[in-house]
Interface confidence: low
């Protein structure tokens, strides 16, 4: 309710005013309907529909009738209120879509335009594959795509729902950062629930971050309103934007947004493959045509930049494919489930002492051979999802298999009396699933002409939009500069972050007798004088830097102490604080052989005479803790010689690993690294530990780690990462690549069990690779989690490296 609004005021001359009138005055802006604060005559004056949205031959030169939705009178151009096809029908002009593609090398704007305006045309539920329908169904959109810059698809954020994604587009933030973590969500501090329908969504307290329209306003750039009340017809939205574009210079906004509820509405109803989808797509295209014809009519079609963008895709889902938690849990009435294409579970009762998320997870884990969802504590979700660090995200999360739904119990799912489902499509699944991918097209003077770019994530668009408007972006999750290749000219030139801690290159050799590791192998070395040789090897730098650090030394972006340790087959940045490497890098050629490890080396390690005993791990800690074992960052199996193998067993190559996780890590090192090297003509691998106990996606400080691992001398990583780089052109070996690079990265959860993989009792070949693909990640994710900066020394431009760092290898089939 809006008790303060005096609706007796009038919208005469105020329709779609850009300044929102404050109480007690009634409003005439495009959101007044949502807030129920419009003046009494808003519908009558501002939502006129008489005679439709188009000129017909018989309307040309009509006597102006103010009741008409738009005009075809001789004065309409001067008045800025023509129907968008006025010049086509009445003056013999061509439709924009019928004109040839033309390269707009520089914006051709009327006098008074300080910068090319930006129009963001957002469409709900536009699955990337809809673009395949082409110009027969969507001639206008197809022209934008082929004449402008497009990607095969754009990745939404998880969950692939409307509100989280629209607000991510506006802020460049992940939902965990901006707060809109779902279309519906409960905030335990507010003790309130946010729903798509309902008034709570109008409360500013839910919306974090800085959206583009605020960034613009703060920097003196006018923004048209980004939201439209659902009752305002699409045609009226377009005509309004066109009218705003004719405002005097000092009133005219520089950025505008259009939003269409289609094709999402139809996608839900008919499913993404329903033949009925053609009509809504035609309708959207018609609106795009009206926009472009309208811009041409205003002589702005070679001035403005247009972004055509979706929020998420659409999957074929019906209620017959529903998993019921009542088949797994006895107490579903004690929980609240946010149901559907993902599941979020919380206790129905606040402060319920009996509520045990771990017990619920146990009852939901691997219980059926054909289970269509996987339960996670939110901190164990794949890090690429960035879906944990917010109190509105419940502790228990269910990742649902594509094409399926999850519900509490059968009573919670409804069908028509005929038994048919009420929907055929839905979205919300894992954001790497190809049906969830959506569309991106950029068209106009600032975008490149006829250019196809690789897929990217929607968190990156906020920075691009700021660039288009000459704004300095607020802090966000995008990587500024990573999309420079979309733009004809770049106002922003990214620079490499400064290295904060330079490494130490150890010059001291500690006496062998100083070490008591509790597990040394050195007594197994024959002959005895070989030991000195092995230790001397540790001090000869040789050419390992060039061979194993193909892209320069990773930079450490926080204050710490670490040593560079050279070896024949690998190189490490060894932390004196964590007593393990921050990173270990090695290059594996296509021809590399996997060798076995001698029995006498399998259960012992060697002291590293370059590192003080007080900065070395001690095996006694592992002997006393049966739950913990250790593994190696450089795989002993890939040693180039028997002598080099001893380097792999140095205590400085050792990291704490749960026995269950070692199965994953060993299979990765023994089988998959070799497989990748064979397939890709050699690979460079950088691996290391991650500490993210507070699951905020950022590197934990030493103090933070101490809070979580009290009483342990060796901090246990929460994850291990691996970055695998090769030449994009597999005909070139990884270490002699002069073209673009190809990267795939993983952030593997370091857990004491393998219950995430239901078939982990089987041979590793049956499940490890699937697990790794699930935990695929961007290099950028790893950089945030480690405070390291990779790829600092290459022949490629820095924006190209940023594009590489923001790439996610999805292991999905083509869109």
């Amino acid at each position: 309710d809006s008790p303060w609004t005096n609706i007796s005021g009038s919208c005469k001359g105020r329709c779609f005013e850009l300044q929102e009138a404050g109480p007690p005055d009634c409003r005439c802006d495009n959101l007044c309907k949502s807030y129920t604060s419009c003046c009494h005559d808003f519908d009558e004056l501002c939502l006129k529909t008489a005679r439709g949205w188009e000129c017909t031959k018989d309307r040309c030169g009509e006597v102006r009738n103010e009741e008409n939705a738009c005009h075809c009178s001789e004065d309409c151009l001067a008045r800025g209120d023509c129907c968008t096809n006025y010049q086509v029908v009445c003056k013999g002009e061509s439709h924009w879509v019928d004109d040839d593609c033309e390269e707009i090398k520089a914006a051709e704007c009327p006098a008074g335009f300080v910068r090319p305006p930006l129009i963001i045309f957002s469409v709900d539920g536009f699955r990337a594959s809809y673009m395949k329908k082409g110009s027969k169904v969507m001639p206008n959109i197809e022209k934008l795509r082929s004449c402008g810059t497009h990607s095969p698809y754009m990745r939404p954020v998880y969950p692939t729902k409307t509100f989280p994604n629209l607000y991510t587009l506006a802020t460049g933030l992940y939902p965990e950062s901006h707060g809109i973590v779902g279309n519906s969500m409960y905030d335990p501090v507010f003790d309130a629930t946010f729903h798509l329908r309902g008034r709570e969504k109008f409360n500013h307290r839910w919306w974090g971050g800085q959206p583009l329209w605020i960034t613009a306003t703060k920097q003196g750039v006018k923004a048209g309103t980004f939201f439209w009340s659902v009752v305002i017809p699409h045609e009226r939205r377009i005509l309004t934007i066109l009218q705003w574009l004719t405002l005097p210079d000092h009133e005219r906004p520089s950025v505008y947004a259009f939003y269409s509820e289609q094709p999402d509405f139809s996608g839900h109803k008919y499913g993404p493959f329903g033949p009925e989808m053609t009509n809504p797509l035609r309708e959207i295209d018609k609106i795009v045509g009206q926009l472009m014809d309208g811009l041409k009519q205003l002589k702005l079609h070679r001035c403005v930049n247009v972004i055509f963008v979706g929020d998420h895709g659409m999957e074929d889902v019906t209620c017959d494919r529903t998993e019921f938690l009542s088949n797994y849990l006895t107490n579903v009435d004690d929980i609240t489930l946010v149901p559907g294409t993902l599941g979020r579970i919380r206790s129905k009762f606040s402060n319920n002492a009996k509520y045990d998320p771990k017990a619920i997870i146990a009852n939901l884990t691997c219980k059926k051979p054909d289970q269509h969802f996987k339960p996670y504590l939110k901190q164990h979700l794949p890090k690429r999802l960035h879906y944990a660090n917010n109190r509105r995200i419940e502790d228990i999360h269910l990742l649902v298999e594509r094409r399926w739904h999850v519900a509490r119990k059968p009573l919670d799912v409804y069908k028509k009396p005929s038994g048919k489902c009420f929907f055929q499509g839905d979205h919300g699944f894992d954001n790497k699933v190809n049906s969830m991918q959506t569309v991106f097209v950029g068209y106009g003077s600032t975008f490149k002409y006829k250019t196809k770019v690789p897929p990217f994530e929607n968190i990156e668009l906020y920075n691009v939009m700021c660039d288009l408007l000459g704004l300095k972006p607020a802090p966000n999750n995008g990587t500024h500069g990573s999309l420079n290749h979309l733009l004809r000219t770049n106002t922003f030139r990214p620079t490499m972050p400064e290295e904060v801690t330079r490494p130490n290159y150890p010059g001291i050799m500690y006496l062998q007798s100083d070490f008591d590791l509790g597990c040394t192998c050195d007594d197994k070395v024959e002959p005895k004088n070989k030991l000195d040789e092995l230790n001397k090897r540790l001090h000869t730098k040789g050419s390992t830097e060039e061979r194993h650090l193909l892209y320069g030394r990773p930079a450490v972006l926080y204050r710490t102490r670490y040593d560079i340790l050279y070896h024949t087959d690998f190189e490490s940045g060894y932390s004196e604080i964590f007593l393990m490497p921050l990173w270990t890098s090695y290059t594996v050629s296509k021809q590399a052989e996997v060798s076995s490890v001698p029995d006498h080396l399998t259960s012992c390690v060697r002291p590293d005479v370059r590192v003080s005993p007080s900065f070395s791990q001690n095996c006694l800690a592992y002997k006393n803790d049966k739950q913990m074992s250790y593994g190696f960052l450089f795989p002993p199996y890939l040693s180039s010689s028997p002598e080099a193998k001893y380097d792999a067993f140095l205590v400085t190559n050792m990291v704490p690993m749960y026995p269950a996780f070692k199965r994953v890590w060993n299979y990765f090192q023994r089988v998959l690294v070799k497989k990748y090297a064979s397939e890709r003509n050699g690979v460079n691998v950088i691996s290391g530990p991650i500490f993210d106990y507070d699951y905020d996606g950022l590197h934990d400080t030493e103090d933070k780690i101490k809070q979580y691992v009290e009483g342990s001398s060796i901090p246990v990583p929460t994850h291990y990462y691996s970055i695998i780089t090769s030449c994009l052109d597999f005909t070139q070996p990884a270490d002699k690549c002069d073209g673009p690079l190809s990267v795939s990265s993983f952030i593997l959860p370091h857990r004491p069990d393998n219950e995430e993989s239901c078939n982990s009792s089987e041979d590793e070949s049956k499940w490890v690779e699937e697990l790794m693909k699930m935990h695929t990640a961007r290099v950028r994710d790893i950089e945030h989690l480690t405070s390291l900066d990779f790829f600092r020394k290459t022949s490629r431009s820095y924006p190209e490296i940023l594009t590489l760092k923001t790439y996610l290898h999805t292991y999905e089939s083509e869109i």
């Epitope: 129920t36 009752v231 009396p417 929907f423």
Partner: antibody, heavy 123, light 107 residues
């Protein structure tokens, strides 16, 4: 054909509780959602609450919160509404009604109604 | 809560008359509005859902219109069996609320 058959009339003392049942037939009960609506003598309709899937739980009007409990027993295709701490102003006809579901989700459109149960609260 | 206000509270009409009942919501409810008919001693019956869609089995003389805050139920030609009380109901948000009812009586 969907039918909702409610339990018979009840006379209750103030402070006591009443439990009204609503048995469904025709169609699968597991695909039903049920709301309860009451009507005091000579008055209009008043929504009390219902089992609403989109919220994953029973939902109640603020006015009845703490006094009303709505449950369902799939094995007998029966929904129940229990109202406690009865007072004279609770005298009304209590209806169960099926919540319809459409393409975009669960809409509180009541397409089938029970015959009603008169509950009289009198000392 | 969203308040629903019907007008008039009652009206007298003759068989064959065109009858219009209006319902106003205290805030915009888009098209989330239903109309019900109730005869004495009987349960309500759904006539119109989503503001303007006719429920199957309901005679075509009943029609609904409106969107946002103002809605109308029209009976194009009143029949003897149409004398009853009519209720509007919003289902945009919980709690669900009904109008106070409009009683259509014989003149």
């Amino acid at each position: 054909q969907v039918q909702l058959v409610q339990s018979g009339a009840e006379v209750k003392k103030p402070g006591s509780s009443v439990k009204v049942s609503c048995k469904a037939s025709g169609g699968t009960f597991s695909s039903y959602a049920i709301s309860w609506v009451r009507q005091a003598p000579g008055q209009g309709l008043e929504w009390m609450g219902g089992i609403i899937p989109i919220f994953g739980t029973a939902n109640y009007a603020q006015k009845f919160q703490g006094r009303v409990t709505i449950t369902a027993d799939e094995s007998t295709s029966t929904a129940y509404m229990e109202l406690s701490s009865l007072r004279s102003e609770d005298t009304a006809v209590y209806y169960c009604a099926r919540i319809a579901r459409y393409a975009r989700g669960y809409m509180h459109t009541f397409d089938y109604w029970g015959q009603g149960t008169l509950v009289t609260v009198s000392s | 809560d969203i308040q629903m206000t019907q007008s008039p509270s009652s009206l007298s009409a003759s068989v064959g008359d065109r009858v219009t009942i209006t319902c106003r919501a205290s805030q915009s409810i888009s098209s989330y509005l239903n109309w019900y008919q109730q005869k004495p001693g009987k349960a309500p019956k759904l006539l119109i859902y989503a503001a303007s869609s006719l429920q199957s089995g309901v005679p075509s003389r009943f029609s609904g219109s409106g969107s946002g805050t103002d809605f109308t139920l029209t009976i194009s030609s009143l029949q003897p069996e149409d004398f009853a009380t009519y209720y509007c109901q919003q289902h945009l948000s919980i709690p669900i609320t009904f109008g106070q009812g409009t009683k259509v009586e014989i003149k």
